[in-house]
């Protein structure tokens, strides 16, 4: 039975040209996290494997940095980065937990961060 929940940075806004940290946190479970995948829509951005460490997809190497923690930092943001981001926690013995973040990249100089929220 999957008892865990993923808390994410929620719905966030950032300025074009800036950077943003995407973060998820798995709680309420004692399951072991074996790997965390970060995806943008259907593209794999990065993998953090418990044994092998980080792997950043080659096409994102220039703009994606690992961390902090199991999070991911996106740099040199463009309007095309607007969209969904997923953190996919592979755990044992629970299975897979998925968190979702929606990022809006703004042309203007005003960008406010949304509130944190829970995803069961």
């Amino acid at each position: 039975m999957m008892t865990g929940t993923i808390e994410t940075t929620g719905n966030i806004s950032a300025e074009k040209g800036g950077s943003i940290i995407l973060q998820c946190h798995l709680s309420s479970t004692t399951a072991q996290v074996t790997q965390v995948n970060w995806e943008q829509q259907d593209q794999l951005l990065a993998i953090c494997n418990a044994d092998l460490g980080w792997h950043i997809s080659p096409s994102f190497k220039d703009r994606v940095a690992p961390g902090p923690g199991l999070g991911l930092t996106l740099q040199s943001l463009t309007v095309n980065d607007t969209g969904e981001y997923f953190c996919i926690y592979h755990t044992y013995p629970d299975g897979t937990y998925t968190g979702r973040i929606f990022l809006e990249v703004l042309e203007s100089s005003v960008a406010e961060h949304g509130a944190r929220f829970q995803i069961p």
Epitope: N11, Q41, D42, T82, G83, E84, F86, T98, R100, F102, E104, G114
Partner: nanobody, 125 residues
Framework: QVQLVESGGGVVQPGRSLRLSCAAS????????MGWFRQAPGKERESVAA????????YYADSVKGRFTISRDNSKNTLYLQMNSLRAEDTAVYYC??????????????????WGQGTLVTVSS
């Protein structure tokens, strides 16, 4: 409980167009992120397009980009999918889905709360 009813499916020749509609019950349609999904015979359900509650953000699967357009009319509680340049591989049952609330679009089926019964689109010469 939200009720979703799709319409507009049918048989169409390759290269032609079709417009699907999805009528939703309830008074909070303007707060529902919505999406279109499809399932071809013997295949898994896949996302086609999705749209935010206010219509500002939309998503398209790579296979339909440039051919399909998702839109909504919040005054009519209706979601649309305009399908142009249809291909044989677009043949499937098309489903609309909605969430109670949320920001942006939702491209994955797991996030949706309510589903319609589907409408069949057959592209054949």
């Amino acid at each position: 409980q939200v009720q979703l009813v799709e319409s507009g499916g049918g048989v169409v020749q390759p290269g032609r167009s079709l417009r699907l509609s999805c009528a939703a019950s309830g008074n909070s349609f303007s707060s529902y992120p919505m999406g279109w999904f499809r399932q071809a015979p013997g295949k898994e359900r896949e996302s086609v397009a999705a749209i935010s509650s206010d219509g500002r953000f939309s998503y398209y699967a790579d296979s339909v980009k440039g051919r399909f357009t998702i839109s909504r009319d919040n005054s009519k509680n209706t979601l649309y999918l305009q399908m142009n340049s249809l291909r044989a591989e677009d043949t499937a049952v098309y489903y609309c889905a909605c969430r109670d609330s949320g920001s942006g679009y939702y491209s994955r089926a797991q996030w949706y709360d309510y589903w319609g019964q589907g409408t069949l689109v057959t592209v054949s010469s």
